[in-house]
């Protein structure tokens, strides 16, 4: 069977029909559908005007306007709010009724297509083996990235989100829409990875999606993510106004003229260097979301009772901090170098900046504990990657399923850990799950390109597929059309299990607490260790103080601070402008190297970005507890510049007050309403509260945006704020 | 000018078929979309579907699906609507109506034919 | 099917006044119409796309509204405007509210 040409609100669409086999199987492809207008920079999306006659649907559209890999030039386009569909049909009657899945694809929200890098003529985000193998209809798209997706003034002049906006047209074009292809419009799951995890996440949290979500799933990226939300989003507008040519002493005319200017030149003024970086890369990621008033109400850790009936599936990867650790720390995919206590007290304390001196150690001390034991330098390095696996990935999503069990109602709630090893060959060979190893066997690629992948890389595709495909049909990613290798349990407070996905799975594959202790750490130890002021010294390693960091700014100066010179071991400074700054990592559909053996570019789509409020506490042992969130707006400062602004500034030591109390016991206190800048922050209501959804405040057109505190422009961000 | 023209009133039997037809002239007629509303006595409207006239290609309302075929004749800038297995429930008056333009709303209107279906 | 609902279903006034009539989409859509319907006549657009004014309407009539929520405003109410009035919504399958019988009072 076939669909032919589908009505759908624009006007009529055709697509390809492609026979599978001898059985008669097919399926149906539509590619470049419009879901909006072409937009406008810097303007929210507005629904298309439509055709008449029948639009061809059969290639990709042009992704969003962004940088190339090198930085030095753009591709993509303006026009770009287009979307693709995967409809499997059988012998007879057209399908109807199916699951349909939309896929939102990662890329620091900064890069990336719907379609993803293309090798041996099959792109990465291709829906064919998801739609066949699952019996679902996938639906990918793009959304606009970097500055044109996310740059804001911090208020109404430039409210931004404009790329998430992009990302909720999609999901309600589909639920209006997908009932004509022979999906059920009551039963859309959002999946996604890295950035594009997050923003499922995201999506889930915002009202402007009521009703329009059944189930999600997280790969890589949630909400909670400390590189998701942007703080102080001024800061880096007014460092892309100034590298155009804009005025940057009215915020109003500062966006008008940002809204005329050339969009490729905006999207050029920033860029993301990426060596010889003073501080950890996701300082450097400035244009992501932000909290807006409106389609993101509030702090993501509040808005937990939105995603109250939604199923939710989320994971990680087991070394997704890898490319980052490799990025900020060179040597660690070096056989001949070796990591030193001294560069990694360095990065522990430049991730840990709000706590002071006892922060970096503390943390140092905790993750260098086997150290003594197995001096290794595997095992050094594997702890490097440890640590930025915790901190950018799996505390924040073991807090965001905390969360979201707390809060769900009759939805159920999912947790697994990517564990098959990635397949690069440059790699050591203790390297695990990498960031965005996950996508190729979710996507089929051992199927679609069997070429260098073997069969137990296709087990681990097809148990994938199984259970997301199932959970897609009914919320239950054991049950379904899809056979699977072993009982997923769901993930409780009390048990905080999770799936172990690797290439041999059994009863043991179900496993409990992941990384308990460093969780625990995160959650209680960490987040009660006072906070500094901006006046007190920053860490200093423990041989010496040879590489001190430069101190951080302490009042309203718009210059950065000075970095140590001489031979005091410092760092050197990031690269500015145009001087020729290597390349962004590679990111899933850039079609750069390094490639797997699988070409499918499974390099990670999503470097982590900025600073995304402090995660709320996980429960910790068997307390059943609730995990209770911070809440306060803790105002965190902006992050560094990465023009031609000189060097970027030392984050600050923070001033948001007492750290949040972690849950203790069985207290069984009201929750606190926040209350502005109290000096404790406030609990807000977790578990089975009944709290109504959060509204959005104001109208979408003139979004009210939280006020941005300018005197706060030359510091960096905290990036660590559990 | 845009005119539709559509053909005379029809009484019918239950179970029979009724087929009426709507003439276009006045602009390029396969360029835009032609659809099919109806309106029973003292009732209000509702979309039964739509036709490409540039290729044919249909789309009918769930409700309608397996009772109505909509077709075109470019050679006379005609579109057809026939409606089977008539019951008495279909008296009503059936309107082509022609989109504004993209996939805006409906702009132009045939002055309507009614179909009684009584026994 | 996205379900449409009109308020009032019927409602009395006098040429001058300002009317106001509300349509409410069951979910969020993009695309919103107002047509006026005189008895034994065919529809008539009077606004598209929510808010644009067909051609040789006059600009008495406005309309407002995005999402689920959606007005159509006759600012001074002559003769010729007692009809009944009808939202519509364009997705793929586009359905009408039940209709406004504006009448004189």
């Known amino acids: 069977a076939k669909l032919g040409a589908v009505y759908t609100e624009g006007g009529f669409v055709e697509g390809v029909n492609k026979k599978l086999g001898l059985l008669g199987d097919s399926v149906d492809i539509f590619k470049g559908i419009p879901f909006a207008a072409p937009t406008k920079a810097l303007e929210n999306p507005q629904p298309h005007p439509g055709w008449q006659g029948t639009l061809k649907a059969k290639n990709f559209k042009k992704r969003c306007l962004q940088a190339t890999i090198t930085q030095d030039s753009t591709y993509g386009d303006e026009d770009c709010l287009y979307l693709n569909i995967w409809v499997p049909q059988g012998r007879k009657q057209v399908s109807r009724d199916l699951p349909v899945m939309i896929w939102i694809y990662g890329g620091a929200f900064l890069m990336g297509s719907g379609h993803g890098a293309n090798f041996l003529n099959n792109y990465l985000y291709d829906g064919e083996e998801i739609a066949t193998r699952g019996n679902v209809i996938v639906v990918t798209f793009n959304y606009r990235v970097g500055p044109l997706g996310f740059l804001s003034t911090g208020d109404a002049n430039l409210p931004g989100n404009y790329g998430l906006r992009d990302q909720h047209m999609a999901i309600a074009w589909v639920k209006r829409n997908i009932a004509a292809f022979g999906g059920d419009p009551n039963n859309i799951t959002l999946f996604g990875e890295s950035a594009g995890g997050a923003s499922v996440s995201l999506q889930t949290l915002s009202p402007y999606n009521k009703g329009l979500i059944r189930r999600a799933i997280s790969q890589s990226g949630v909400a909670l993510s400390p590189w998701v939300i942007q703080k102080n989003p001024l800061f880096w507008a007014k460092k892309v106004a100034e590298k155009v040519g804009c005025p940057v002493g009215d915020a109003a005319r500062m966006a008008q003229c940002l809204k005329v200017t050339d969009p490729r030149a905006l999207t050029l003024a920033y860029k993301v260097p990426l060596a010889g970086l003073e501080y950890p890369m996701l300082h450097y990621v400035g244009f992501v979301p932000v909290i807006d008033g409106d389609f993101i109400p509030a702090d993501p850790i509040n808005l937990y009772a939105n995603a109250a009936d939604i199923d939710y599936i989320a994971g990680t990867n087991n070394m997704d901090g890898h490319i980052f650790a490799s990025i900020d720390m060179p040597a660690i995919n070096k056989g001949n170098k070796k990591v030193t206590e001294e560069d990694f007290y360095k990065l522990v304390s430049e991730f840990t900046i709000t706590k002071g001196l006892r922060g970096a150690k503390t943390t140092f001390d905790v993750y260098t504990e086997s150290w003594a034991q197995d001096p290794s330098q595997e095992n050094k390095k594997k702890t490097v990657v440890d640590f930025e696996t915790d901190v950018l990935f799996l505390v924040p999503t073991e807090i965001a399923l905390a969360q979201h069990r707390a809060n769900a109602k009759s939805a159920k709630t999912y947790a697994y850990l990517f564990s098959h090893p990635s397949r690069m060959p440059v790699y050591p060979k203790w390297v695990g799950a990498d960031h965005a190893d996950d996508i190729q066997y979710v996507f089929g690629k051992p199927f679609a390109t069997p070429t260098g992948y073997r069969p137990q890389d296709r087990t681990v595709s097809k148990a994938m597929i199984a259970y997301w495909t199932n959970f897609a049909k009914t919320g239950d990613p054991n049950m379904g059309d899809s056979a699977v290798p072993t009982h997923w349990e769901p993930y409780t407070t009390e048990n905080s299990g999770y799936l172990e996905i690797t290439k041999k799975m059994g009863s043991s594959s179900m496993k409990r607490s992941l990384r308990t202790n460093f969780l625990r750490y995160w959650t209680l130890t960490y987040l009660a260790l006072p906070t500094v002021t901006d006046q007190e010294a920053t860490p200093v390693p423990p041989t010496g103080d040879s590489e001190a960091t430069p101190v951080p700014p302490t009042g309203d100066s718009e210059t950065a601070p000075v970095p140590p010179t001489g031979d005091s071991g410092a760092p050197p400074v990031p690269p500015t402008g145009d001087s020729g700054a290597p390349p962004v990592p590679p990111t899933g559909d850039s079609g750069a190297p390094p490639v797997p053996p699988t070409g499918d570019s499974g390099a990670p789509p999503v470097p982590p970005t900025g600073d995304s409020g402090a995660p709320p506490v996980p429960p910790t042992g068997d307390s059943g507890a609730p995990p209770v969130p911070p809440t306060g707006d803790s105002g965190a400062p902006p992050v560094p510049p990465t023009g031609d602004a000189g060097p970027p500034p030392v984050p600050p030591t923070g001033d948001s007050g007492a750290p949040p109390v972690p849950p203790t016991g069985d207290s069984g206190a009201p929750p606190v309403t926040p209350t502005g800048d109290s000096e404790t922050a406030p609990v807000p209501p977790t578990g089975d509260s009944g709290a109504p959804p959060v509204p959005p405040t104001g109208d979408s057109e003139a979004a009210p945006v939280p006020p941005t505190d300018d005197s706060k422009e030359a510091q960096m961000p905290a990036v660590i704020r559990f | 000018q845009v005119q539709l023209v559509q053909s005379g009133a029809e009484v019918k039997k239950p179970g029979a078929s009724v087929k009426v037809s709507c003439k276009a002239s006045g602009y390029t007629f396969t360029s835009y979309n032609m659809h099919w509303v109806r309106q029973a006595p003292g009732q209000g409207l509702e979309w039964m579907g739509v036709?490409?006239?540039?290729?044919?290609?249909?789309s009918y309302n769930q409700k309608f699906q397996g009772r109505v075929t909509m077709t075109r004749d470019t050679s006379t800038s005609t579109v057809y609507m026939e409606l089977s297995s008539l019951r008495s429930e279909d008296t009503a008056v059936y309107y082509c109506?022609?989109?504004?333009?993209?996939?805006?709303?409906?702009?132009?209107w045939g002055q309507g034919t009614l179909v009684t279906v009584s026994s | 099917d996205i379900q449409m609902t009109q308020s009032p279903s019927s409602l009395s006034a006098s040429v001058g006044d300002r009317v106001t009539i509300t349509c409410r989409a069951s979910s969020s859509i993009s695309y919103l119409n107002w047509y006026q319907q005189k008895p034994g006549k065919a529809p008539k657009l009077l606004i598209y796309a929510a808010s644009s004014l067909a051609s040789g309407v006059p600009s008495r009539f406005s309309g407002s509204g995005s999402g689920t929520d959606f007005t159509l405003t006759i600012s001074s109410l002559q003769p010729e405007d007692f009809a009944t009035y009808y939202c519509h919504q364009r997705s793929s399958s586009p359905t009408f509210g039940q209709g406004t019988k504006l009448e004189i009072k």
């Open positions: 036709i490409n006239p540039g290729d044919g290609a249909t």
């Open positions: 109506a022609r989109d504004y333009y993209g996939s805006s709303p409906l702009g132009y």
